[in-house]
């Protein structure tokens, strides 16, 4: 229920966050699950715990395993599990699938590639970026904050992009790399005021308490390459990331080109283990581009499970 996969490369830094949530003031203890051995908090150790974070500085293949984090609230101890896998560095240039983060898509006018997991680290700009193991050079490539911007994107820009940065811990530097695929949508077309295909305005979505639920926000913005088109979910008028409920996350879908040639975007809102209080929230699907913003509101209602008798 409270478990998360994390991976990294040997001799690089890896920082993992406890999957169990809690207030920042709460003490978090970490253990190596197989031996129940406590992870030290002293920073002189190669592997040490720092609040909600578990730090491997640097990581070793032998560190692979399941780690238990216990968040100590004023009342009860709450447990989460981090499944960590550390891989040997590849001698060739190919990055295996198991080391890849989620694929992102771009277009001629919208080509941001975010560096995965970087928010967990203490790093300073600029990032180094590589495509298929080659360092990116030239004025078309701009490393900005935690993402790469590619100007005048072409089909040939598709590929595997690796960000490399330095994590600093008490004056010591550790390398971190993360790789994700980038795909290019190369179309010519036009832009329209956003049209939300789903959900319908004021839709009532039936969900079952205790089950998982998905809401898809799908909108079309015109034909071909779109500039500054986005779909997103809000909860009670608040961004998902700011709302602070770990069970409710949004997951970006791929650009879609339907049979009518329209350029559309999806954003899936995943609600894990639906709770009664989720029914009190207002779910807004927002679609926006240069023409403006359109909003469709969804509310959840309780679906009573039907008894199936043989």
């Amino acid at each position: 229920k409270f478990s998360k996969q994390s991976w990294g490369l040997e001799n690089e830094a890896l920082i993992v966050r406890c999957p169990r949530q809690g207030k920042p003031s709460y003490t978090v203890d970490w253990y190596y699950s197989q031996t129940n051995k406590s992870i030290p908090t002293q920073e002189r150790n190669r592997v040490f715990a720092s609040g909600q974070l578990l730090k491997f500085l640097p990581a070793a293949v032998a560190d692979s395993g399941i780690y238990t984090c216990i968040v100590r609230s004023p009342t009860f101890n709450r447990t989460g599990y981090a499944n960590v896998t550390i891989y040997k560095k590849q001698s060739d240039c190919n990055v295996p699938d198991y080391l890849m983060y989620s694929t992102v898509s771009g277009s001629e006018k919208n080509s941001k590639i975010y560096c995965p997991t970087i928010d967990l680290y203490n790093w300073t700009a600029p990032l180094e970026w590589f495509k298929n193991c080659q360092a990116l050079q030239g004025s078309r490539y701009r490393a900005h904050k935690s993402f790469l911007v590619i100007d005048n994107v072409m089909t040939e820009d598709a590929g595997d992009y690796t960000c490399k940065f330095i994590h600093n811990e008490n004056g010591a530097n550790y390398s971190v790399t993360a790789t994700r695929s980038f795909t290019v949508k190369d179309e010519q077309g036009f832009s329209l005021f956003p049209v939300i295909g789903a959900p319908a305005q004021n839709e009532i979505k039936e969900v079952e308490i205790g089950k998982n639920a998905n809401l898809t926000c799908s909108a079309c913005f015109g034909k071909g390459t779109q500039f500054l088109a986005a779909v997103l979910w809000q909860l009670n008028g608040t961004k998902i990331t700011d709302f602070g409920e770990p069970r409710i996350q949004q997951e970006e879908g791929q650009n879609q080109s339907f049979s009518n040639g329209l350029a559309c975007l999806d954003m899936v809102l995943r609600i894990a283990d639906v709770k009664e209080e989720d029914l009190l929230l207002q779910y807004d699907c927002l679609a926006l581009n240069l023409h403006g913003l359109r909003r469709h509101t969804v509310r959840l209602s309780r679906k009573n499970p039907i008894d199936h008798h043989s």
Epitope: K23, S73, P74, T75, R78, I209, G244, E276, E277
Partner: antibody
Framework: QVQLVQSGAEVKKPGASVKVSCKAS????????LHWVRQAPGQGLEWMGT????????VYNQKFKARVTMTADKSTSTAYMELSSLRSEDTAVYYC??????????????WGQGTLVTVSS | EIVMTQSPATLSLSPGERATLSCSVS?????MHWYQQKPGQAPRRLIY???KLASGIPARFSGSGSGTDYTLTISSLEPEDAAVYYC?????????FGGGTKVEIK
Amino acid sequence: QVQLVQSGAEVKKPGASVKVSCKASGYTFTDYELHWVRQAPGQGLEWMGTIDPETGDTVYNQKFKARVTMTADKSTSTAYMELSSLRSEDTAVYYCTRAFYNDYDDGFAYWGQGTLVTVSS
Amino acid sequence: EIVMTQSPATLSLSPGERATLSCSVSSSVSYMHWYQQKPGQAPRRLIYDTSKLASGIPARFSGSGSGTDYTLTISSLEPEDAAVYYCQQWNSSPLTFGGGTKVEIK
């Protein structure tokens, strides 16, 4: 919707015990710690303790530790608070309550209607 | 045990006036929750985590503070705001409440 429905009013003699029930509905009972808070007539609120219905683990306010027992029945989604060796100053309204999101301990968002326990000889 | 002291004990104001309720804590806490209670009713959560407005609570209610001093503010009193208001800490066990501030509307 989330509901906490408590048992009815009780009149007890000093030295007796009382057991108040709190039936939860509208959410997964084992996902949330349930707390008990009492309020003497014209007085403020006093936290008595809490139970994790999943494990049955309890944390009691030291003031009540010797006399209070909190239990939970997962099969009926009902929590119980038993207070023994009653005295007149235990006359109060007893509430069961829970947080909005459990991990964040974000205040008591849901309350039962309260159970008046009167201790009188 | 963390002791919570609320002041004033009673606050008597006219509709439209600003109400400021204080909660002083015997040792520093990270967050404060506030509740409203009307006669014969269970308490109702108003503010959680010091400054976050609970669902369904009017925006005239706000919370602030840190460490040992916290404040609940009602920017413009309405007649229905007549009630007793309690602060509560969830920083350490036992969880404790303040003694309450009674708000009367003239």
